[in-house]
């Protein structure tokens, strides 16, 4: 039960995290005009990964996309790449983890396959979260550097624009969304990896037990359970009876001791 809960919670946490990474990537407020210790202007500037915006006090907002690709700073391109990689990995991870969920039965999928898929999705979530955290952190570092370098007529490094008024930019809401979302995706991934350990059948040794029943002589032979050697191997436990009784491969699958921890 704990494994299912851990896996389910990991999936939900990762889902929220990836939704947050997507939201952060699309948001315009990665950097916002620093209002502290500056003249009070009737316009407010903010910038995202894809466009820069100006909101006038009148309420009118105008956004302009960065239509150039080569003219953009390498750091901005790197941040874009990290966020997109994070989203793609996260999306694939979500797809894989849906099929890996213990509560969802797909054909006669074995526990080992589900364990494999859970581990794969967990690793994907971890890498996705790290990509998002790295992307946001690189952008934040770029902002901090530009903030202290920011002087009149300085190249901002964001949109290739020349500043004639000292406009300094500080952390926008998207950075905090990105950090939190990346963290959640990372946590979700770790939870999936933990859940995977519980899903994987353990190496089990059973000693031979023999007893005499009236009328019939039945012995459970030693080595009656074929131990699993790891992911990808045959983990179906074949009970070997005298008289060649049918194996568990031929019967409907029921919860085994490996389902619950």
């Amino acid at each position: 039960m704990a494994v299912t809960a851990c896996q389910g919670l990991g999936f939900v946490v990762s889902l929220i995290g990836i939704a947050g990474i997507i939201a952060a990537t699309c948001m315009d407020q990665w950097s916002t005009q620093d209002l502290y210790n500056n003249p009070v202007t009737a316009v407010f500037n903010y910038q995202g990964l894809w466009r820069s915006c100006v909101r006038e006090s009148s309420g009118f907002t105008e956004c302009r996309g960065y239509f150039t690709l080569l003219g953009l700073p390498a750091m901005l391109q790197a941040v874009r790449a990290l966020m997109i990689v994070g989203i793609v990995l996260g999306a694939i991870g979500l797809l894989v983890s849906i099929f890996a969920l213990k509560c969802i039965r797909i054909g006669s999928m074995e526990d080992s396959a589900k364990a494999n898929m859970t581990l794969t999705s967990g690793i994907m979530f971890i890498v996705s979260g790290l990509c998002a955290i790295a992307g946001v952190s690189v952008f934040a570092n770029m902002l901090v550097t530009n903030f202290w370098m920011s002087t009149a007529n300085m190249y901002t490094g964001m949109g290739g624009m020349v500043q004639t008024v000292q406009t300094r930019y500080t952390f926008g809401a998207a950075l905090f969304v990105g950090w939190v979302a990346g963290g959640l995706t990372l946590i979700g991934g770790v939870m999936m990896c933990i859940a995977c350990r519980g899903l994987a059948p353990e190496e089990t040794n059973y000693k031979a037990v023999s007893y005499h029943a009236s009328g019939h002589s039945v012995a459970y032979k030693p080595g009656g359970f074929k131990a699993s050697t790891g992911f990808g191997s045959n983990t179906k436990n074949k009970k070997i009876y005298d008289g060649g009784a049918r194996t568990e491969d031929e019967v409907q699958s029921y919860p085994s001791k490996h389902d619950y921890v």
């Epitope: 005009q33 003249p39 009070v40 202007t41 009737a42 316009v43 500037n45 903010y46 910038q47 820069s52 915006c53 100006v54 006038e56 006090s57 009148s58 309420g59 009118f60 105008e62 302009r64 901002t156 624009m161 020349v162 500043q163 004639t164 008024v165 406009t167």
Partner: antibody, heavy 117, light 113 residues
Framework: QVQLQESGPGLVKPSETLSLTCTVS????????VSWIRQPPGKGLEWIGV???????NYNPSLKSRVTISKDSSKSQVSLKLSSVTAADTAVYYC???????????WGQGTLVTVSS | DIVMTQSPDSLAVSLGERATINCKSS????????????LTWYQQKPGQPPKLLIY???TRDSGVPDRFSGSGSGTDFTLTISSLQAEDVAVYYC?????????FGGGTKVEIK
């Protein structure tokens, strides 16, 4: 069509509070800001302050301690209160709508306020 | 506060001739975010409220004749009336719409020579 109309007493005694109302039509006060501007007889324009669509205000520092701009969006009215008036506050008072570029695109006809005992 | 200085104080131009009014601000009115200058021009005829002519330094308001044009960037701006008409006799004001308080220039009176 967009219209703004200032109203209020034409004569105010020194040290009293000047109260003016700007009634607007043709637009919503929740979407547009309204500025107050005054013009002493034969002189230039002086910006008093503004109330934005979101309710935030900005005032001219030279008048800030004496001025209050508020609005009642449901009545489509913006009010200006200027306390402790002197003869120097005698002017034509205008209200105007704020649009693109923070520019004042529609103005009221103005109301002359004289400060005299 | 930003000081807006207009020149000349008054200007007499013959009908059909070009009229040029200058406006200088004590600080740049160029916003780096959209590369727009937050300077506005108004026309005020005697006994009337001011009328918006140009915003963002060079964008004509709807209904404004194309003989009116604005130019300039940063701190130096110009309003040009390419061919003065009798109805253009008025006082012209520039305004800083960038940094509070939103100050006006002293005005330039345009008359017919």
């Amino acid at each position: 069509q967009v219209q703004l109309q200032e109203s209020g007493p034409g004569l105010v005694k020194p040290s009293e509070t000047l109260s003016l109302t700007c009634t607007v039509s043709g637009f919503s006060l929740t979407r547009y800001g309204v500025s107050w501007i005054r013009q002493p007889p034969g002189k230039g324009l002086e910006w008093i302050g503004v109330i934005w669509g979101d309710g935030n205000t900005n005032y001219n520092p030279s008048l800030k301690s004496r001025v209050t701009i508020s609005k009642d969006s449901s009545k489509s009215q913006v009010s200006l209160k200027l306390s402790s008036v002197t003869a120097a506050d005698t002017a034509v008072y205008y209200c105007a709508r704020v649009n693109f570029g923070n520019a004042l695109d529609y103005w009221g006809q103005g109301t002359l306020v004289t400060v005299s005992s | 506060d930003i000081v807006m200085t207009q020149s000349p104080d008054s200007l007499a131009v013959s009908l059909g001739e070009r009229a040029t009014i200058n406006c200088k601000s004590s600080q740049s009115l160029l916003n780096s975010g959209n590369q727009k200058n937050y300077l506005t021009w108004y026309q005020q005829k005697p006994g009337q409220p001011p009328k918006l002519l140009i915003y963002w330094a060079s964008t004509r308001d709807s209904g404004v004749p194309d003989r009116f044009s604005g130019s300039g960037s940063g701190t130096d701006f110009t309003l040009t009336i390419s061919s003065l008409q009798a109805e253009d006799v008025a006082v012209y004001y520039c305004q800083n719409d960038f940094i509070f308080p939103l100050t006006f220039g002293g005005g330039t009176k345009v008359e017919i020579k």
